[in-house]
């Protein structure tokens, strides 16, 4: 006997109670492939989740996170809170970046300021919790008549202006 279920398209299920007739998925359920014997329950995007794509008979709903949160995990299974620029999310909540580090995004970790002296440059603009330092040419490069043979002057370490 040929399995009639294989003929059932996505959006339907093979109803064994009705001689393997293809029945449409009930409301709030879907089947994304043909030949299914059951339809899967649609994902509900509620609470901290919001709907990005409605459920249809052939595809599951897709969720996003509400404002103030961002997605984590496969198919946005989790919503992690945003922090302000100049902070990082620790296990106990948002925490200001330590001196010498910065974060210019609402997520991620605080990263160390660039060390200008490693490139033989000086600090043009001091770093803050929200912004990296801006490196400029070394003082030797700025002096009149400086040649490439002139050894670079010692660069200042990144500074931090009071907030």
């Amino acid at each position: 006997l040929q399995d009639l279920c294989s003929n059932c398209p996505a959006g339907t299920f093979c109803d064994n109670n009705r001689s393997q007739i293809c029945s449409p998925c009930p409301p709030n359920s879907f089947s994304s492939a043909g030949g299914q014997r059951t339809c899967d329950i649609c994902r509900q995007c509620k609470g901290v989740f919001k709907t990005r794509k409605e459920c249809s008979s052939t595809s599951n709903a897709e969720c996003d996170c509400i404002s103030g949160y961002h997605c984590l995990g496969a198919e946005c299974s989790m919503c992690e809170q945003d922090c302000k620029q100049g902070q990082e999310l620790t296990k106990k909540g948002c925490k200001d970046c330590c001196f010498g580090t910065f974060n210019d995004q609402k997520r991620g970790i605080c990263r160390p300021w660039t060390n200008c002296s490693l490139d033989g440059k000086s600090v043009l603009v001091n770093g803050t919790k929200e912004r990296d330092v801006v490196c400029g040419p070394s003082p030797a490069d700025l002096s009149p008549g400086a040649s490439s043979a002139t050894p670079p002057a010692p660069a200042r370490e990144p500074g931090h202006s009071p907030q």
């Epitope: 992690e80 990082e88 999310l89 620790t90 296990k91 106990k92 925490k95 970790i109």
Partner: nanobody, 124 residues
Framework: EVQLLESGGGLVQPGGSLRLSCAAS????????MSWFRQPPETGLKWVSS????????YYADSVKGRFTISRDNSKNTLYLQMNSLRAEDTAVYYC?????????????????WGQGTTVTVSS
């Protein structure tokens, strides 16, 4: 392939207990700190507890301290969360997580692998 598979969730009455397990595979379990996080229905992901690689140091969120106990069996590549005196506000999807760092209580989320989650519902 690195995988974390949680189990042990379910429906429990307030005051009841549950024990969650997380079976790890695809990496040297005993080398990494591990954590539990939870996603309540109405709010964002929250850290619950962490344990260092050896199991010697454990850390807890204030909301679960004294009620939950994290442990691990490195010979079985398994992480556990014993949850006692459960409350309605403990209702959430619980996720097991592999830490990339030392797993202290105030470190940033240095999580590089998440499990698929297990649902805990506390209701009468």
């Amino acid at each position: 392939e690195v995988q974390l598979l949680e189990s042990g969730g379910g429906l429990v009455q307030p005051g009841g207990s549950l024990r969650l397990s997380c079976a790890a595979s695809g990496f040297t379990f005993s080398n990494y700190a591990m954590s539990w996080f939870r996603q309540p229905p109405e709010t964002g992901l929250k850290w619950v507890s962490s344990i260092d690689a050896s199991g010697g140091d454990t850390y807890y969120a204030d909301s679960v301290k004294g009620r939950f106990t994290i442990s691990r069996d490195n010979s079985k590549n398994t992480l556990y969360l014993q949850m006692n005196s459960l409350r309605a506000e403990d209702t959430a999807v619980y996720y097991c997580a592999k830490e990339g760092s030392h797993g202290t209580d105030d470190s940033h989320y240095d999580v590089d692998v998440w499990g698929q989650g297990t649902t805990v519902t506390v209701s009468s």
